[in-house]
Interface confidence: medium
């Protein structure tokens, strides 16, 4: 008779994570008689996954009835597969010793394990960022199997170019992980914006996974100041507002100074959102001329989400306010509107007038 | 290891039965055949039968095909020869055998038991 | 059925000198370079111990003294060395078919 031949008919299987997988072999020969082992790997450090005569394997089951003398079949069941169970899998021929002697391998079949992955989750920035400056996002998947995966990025709707995606790890390995950056130049309208991280896999038929990161953890959208006076009211007093405009987030304290001292501080809070997601504020002061010599330097100081405190300034002419009522009233904007779009070292503006 | 323990000595009239026992430890009982031989006193081996723990298949050698029983039960990992219509001539020490390698062969040997036939 | 038969009977030889015990079959018990027969030594009072497979391969944990050749019908064990503990009794076996024994073969020293 010819010599014995051990014969797994399939090169690959793939089987989807908790379904069952058949490994099929045959021999072409009863001789020599001697049991069948099943390896995952090759070599000395090769893991036995089934032996026809010893141990106990309660997730593989020989498809036939193996210890039947005339059986040249030893396939083998694997129940409730893991990404874990992936590998190439050997059927060997023994012939009886002590230990057992090595006959004949079959060429091996590939498991490859269909897995899904896991939600892709995005994060973003650790530190918010102004209009013009680009902020990363980083989507992370994990657990997925086989390894081609394609992902995606979005920024409301509009597919964004600017990414790098790794996946790990390069080898071969049972499962794998995607990690990807995206880079996204803010602009003074994306409070409402949304990065979009978009994971398609074989396993998932189709229908992508998506993760979102909306940009308004990431942006700040720092307040225009304007200081202006109102008409004189007829008990000598003057009111000046500080209009605070089109910021974000609402974490934002004004404090009033007269002549450089602490009038009056307030906290934003429940205010009404623009349209574009903005906060506007508006603040008063009434300032009793009649009460000072001298003109009145009025500052509108505002402090934005920790930045540092932008100011606005404003000098009310005390000799124009004659002590009768009904004077003309003259008034100096001093102030400048002072936006932070400088880095941190550059936003501390004291304006003296 | 592989450790097959053999029920006590038995003393028999002609014409009754015994049931010998062979308890298995060691091993997986079901993944392997066990052989019943028997050797009488000053005598050679004589294959009675084997039988296949996991579906019970037997196989029998013709001289003991109508007398002989083979029984297993695998929620003991225990193997049973029972004889029947037994004559003098079966006294004999019969021994239970694991086949390791569906050989058909006997690498593993309980130590005996003896089976005495006499009126 | 097959049927073994042994030679010699008995056989006695001297301590240190070669001891060889034949098996002939009634028929082929060999296929594909395998050859079905099984070599036992049993001791007094004690079961039989497997020595040999297949004809030729020695069972694990028997010295490398015990040996088995032949092929189709006709087979051998040698013993190279005879030792005081290989006084026994010798049995070859056949799996071609159901399981046969040979009618044993009983070595001394001489």
């Known amino acids: 008779e010819e010599e014995l031949q051990v014969i797994q008919p399939e090169k690959s299987v793939s089987v989807a994570a908790g379904d069952s997988a058949t490994l099929n072999c045959t021999v072409t020969s009863l001789i020599p008689v001697g049991p069948i082992q099943w390896f995952r790997g090759a070599g000395p450090g090769r893991e036995l996954i089934y032996h026809q005569k010893e141990g106990h394997f309660p997730r593989v089951t020989s498809v036939s009835e193996s210890t039947k003398r005339n059986n040249m079949d030893f396939s083998i069941h694997i129940s409730n597969i893991t990404p874990a169970d992936a590998g190439t899998y050997y059927c060997v021929k023994f012939r009886k010793g002590s230990p057992d002697v090595e006959v004949k391998s079959g060429a091996g079949t590939e498991l490859s394990v269909r897995a899904k992955p896991s939600a892709p989750v995005v994060s973003g920035p650790a530190v918010r960022a102004t209009a013009e400056h680009t902020v990363s996002f980083t989507c992370e998947s994990h657990g997925f199997s086989p390894r081609d995966i394609t992902l995606k990025w979005f920024k409301n709707g509009n597919e964004l170019s600017d990414f790098q995606t790794n996946v790990d790890p390069a080898g071969k390995s049972v499962s794998y992980s995607i990690r990807s950056t995206a880079r996204v130049v803010l602009t003074r309208r994306d409070v409402h914006s949304q990065v979009i991280c978009e994971v398609a896999h074989v396993t998932l038929q189709g229908d992508p996974l998506r993760g979102t990161a909306n940009l308004s953890e990431a942006i700040r959208v720092p307040p225009f100041l304007e200081v202006t006076q109102q008409s004189m009211r007829a008990d000598n007093q003057v009111n000046v507002t500080c209009q605070v405009t089109k910021f974000y987030p609402q974490r934002l304290q004004l404090t009033w100074l007269e002549n450089g001292n602490v009038s009056r501080t307030e906290m934003a809070s429940a205010l009404p959102e623009n349209k574009d997601g903005t906060y506007n504020w508006t603040s008063w002061l009434l300032v009793n001329v009649s009460a000072h010599r001298d003109d009145v330097k009025l500052t509108c100081q505002v402090e934005h989400d920790g930045q540092p405190a932008v100011n606005k300034s404003f000098s009310v002419k005390v000799s124009a306010h004659p002590k009768e009522q009904g004077s003309n009233t003259a008034a100096e904007n001093t102030g400048t509107n002072e936006r932070d779009y400088k880095d941190d070292d550059d936003k501390h503006h004291h304006h003296h007038h | 290891q592989v450790q097959l323990v053999q029920s006590g000595a038995e003393v028999k009239k002609p014409g009754a039965s015994v049931k010998v026992s062979c308890k298995a430890s060691?091993?997986?009982?079901?993944?392997?055949?066990i052989n019943w031989v028997r050797q009488a006193p000053g005598q050679g081996l004589e294959w009675i039968a084997m039988?296949?723990?996991?579906?019970?298949?037997?196989h029998y050698n013709q001289i003991f095909k109508d007398r002989a029983t083979l029984t297993t039960d695998t929620s003991t990992s225990t193997a049973y020869m029972e004889l029947r219509s037994l004559r003098s001539d079966d006294t004999a020490v019969y021994y239970c055998?694991?086949?390791?390698?569906?050989?058909?062969?006997?690498?593993?040997w309980g130590r005996g038991t003896l089976v005495t036939v006499s009126s | 059925d097959i049927v073994l038969t042994q030679s010699p009977d008995s056989l006695a030889v001297s301590l240190g000198e070669r001891a060889t015990i034949n098996c002939r079959a009634s028929?082929?018990?060999?296929?594909?370079?395998?050859?079905?027969i099984f070599w036992y030594q049993q001791k007094p009072g004690q079961p039989p111990k497997l020595l040999i497979y297949?004809?030729?391969n020695l069972d694990s944990g028997v010295p490398d003294r015990f040996s088995g050749s032949g092929s189709g019908t006709d087979f051998t064990l040698t013993i190279s060395s005879l030792q005081a503990e290989d006084v026994a009794v010798y049995y070859c076996?056949?799996?071609?078919?159901?399981?046969?024994f040979g009618q044993g073969t009983k070595l001394e020293i001489k």
């Open positions: 055998a694991m086949d390791y390698g569906s050989l058909y062969a006997m690498d593993y």
């Open positions: 060691g091993y997986t009982f079901t993944n392997y055949w």
């Open positions: 039988i296949d723990p996991s579906d019970s298949e037997t």
């Open positions: 028929k082929s018990v060999s296929s594909s370079g395998y050859n079905y």
């Open positions: 297949l004809a030729s």
């Open positions: 076996q056949e799996s071609w078919e159901l399981p046969t």
